[in-house]
Interface confidence: medium
Amino acid sequence: IQVTQPSVVLASSRGIASFVCEYASPGKATEVRVTVLRQADSQVTEVCAATYMMGNELTFLDDSICTGTSSGNQVNLTIQGLRAMDTGLYICKVELMYPPPYYLGIGNGTQIYVIDPEPCPDSD
Amino acid sequence: IQVTQPSVVLASSRGIASFVCEYASPGKATEVRVTVLRQADSQVTEVCAATYMMGNELTFLDDSICTGTSSGNQVNLTIQGLRAMDTGLYICKVELMYPPPYYLGIGNGTQIYVIDPEPCPDSD
């Protein structure tokens, strides 16, 4: 399946980046799994993943840096706690788990840029 | 002439962005003019410009937001005072002014991303 996501997103000065991951579904999937992968220096690592039932809330693990909501074939993803060293290509992977047939789609990635804030001066 | 510059640069949290603009010269130009143009929403505006003699310092106007140094066919440009609204494509234009023949080269642009910092909390 085709997965689309923005090419570039800037994290806020608080280290929060949000983007929409949209997929074209050939049918009425009831169970969908969304995974965010990070590619940097040709290494790919899993950032977070969530499986959700269509119409229900998207729930990541409690210790996940990701949160999200779903609306139809769109998933609104938010990644928090980002620092400059986390700058990289964040790829959205969508799997239509149920009912069969199984479909897999991978986006081209969203380049997330993160700038560390200057520390505030100490208050005397 | 061919002008190369990085495709993306992040401004620091202090609103400072630096990049190198490099040009291929067919001969020994003694007088070179460098102009930084900003393209946003299909509008192109001049950010700053400086003419320099090879081997001498690159001097912008006193009220310019740009500073720079030159080394051979490389110009190291720094733009200061940037805010989020200044995010855009910054294009390096190089003119070999003297001696003839005159050559003009325009780079593909550097996308500068600027994120406004969070204000520091007031000290009580």
């Epitope: - | 291929a24 003009l104 080269g105």
Partner: antibody
Framework: QVQLKESGPGLVAPSQSLSITCTVS????????LSWVRQPPGKGLEWLGV???????NFHSALISRLTISKDNSKSQVFLELNSLQTDDTATYYC???????????????????WGQGTSVTVSS | DIQMTQSPASLSVSVGETVTITCRAS??????LAWYQQKQGKSPQLLVY???NLADGVPSRFSGSGSGTQYSLKINSLQSEDFGTYFC?????????FGGGTKLEIK
């Protein structure tokens, strides 16, 4: 319209000097360069040198010691002088307007966009 | 100095055919290349500048391509008036050397 016309001596003795004048119309020598090119009988083209709008010159490295190019802007004339002629300097000599072309917003490109009809020079005793 | 190597030196073709002439520079000339046509007993005429741009009045059956050190001139559906000698010339810093030329003859 742009026109260039060369006028030369036709026959020159070996070791002597060659002087050719190029008279132009339809453009100003204060705005454009003018190149000299020669072509020996039955052979290819050889770029000799150029004089720019401000009087600056560039020469073919093999001819730098023998070649002088100058001009008189008010008369719209450019002069080529080649010293110490040998038989292999026998050629048709052309002058050509040297234009910087601009396309897109990217580059200044050069070309010899208008040529004179050429003047034939034979070096012989 | 930059050397220009042009090939082939000569070409015998029929009207209506398509021909390609190539020019190789000894170093990168950044598309600063022109093509000229010269007919017997006449002065050269500019055909293409900046490697790909047709000069004013040049028919669209002519096209230039290339970058870096490799360039070519293509003539589609040759007409009788296209026969003559073709020269390339680099204009990337003086001296502005010409290629050796390609003589296009009617078969």
């Amino acid at each position: 319209q742009v026109q260039l016309k060369e006028s030369g001596p036709g026959l020159v003795a070996p070791s002597q000097s060659l002087s050719i004048t190029c008279t132009v119309s339809g453009f100003s020598l204060t705005s454009y360069g003018l190149s000299w090119v020669r072509q020996p009988p039955g052979k290819g083209l050889e770029w000799l040198g150029v004089i720019w709008y401000d009087g600056n010159t560039n020469f073919h490295s093999a001819l730098i010691s023998r070649l002088t190019i100058s001009k008189d802007n008010s008369k719209s004339q450019v002069f080529l002088e080649l010293n110490s002629l040998q038989t292999d300097d026998t050629a048709t000599y052309y002058c050509a307007k040297t234009e910087g072309h601009y396309y897109g917003s990217n580059y200044g490109y050069y070309a010899l966009d208008y040529w004179g009809q050429g003047t034939s020079v034979t070096v012989s005793s | 100095d930059i050397q220009m190597t042009q090939s082939p030196a000569s070409l015998s073709v029929s009207v209506g055919e398509t021909v390609t002439i190539t020019c190789r520079a000894s170093e990168n000339i950044y598309s600063n290349l022109a093509w000229y046509q010269q007919k017997q007993g006449k002065s050269p005429q500019l055909l293409v500048y900046a490697a790909t741009n047709l000069a004013d009045g040049v028919p669209s059956r002519f096209s230039g391509s290339g970058s870096g050190t490799q360039y070519s001139l293509k003539i589609n559906s040759l007409q009788s008036e296209d026969f003559g000698t073709y020269f390339c010339q680099h204009l990337w810093g003086t001296p502005y050397t010409f290629g050796g030329g390609t003589k296009l003859e009617i078969k």
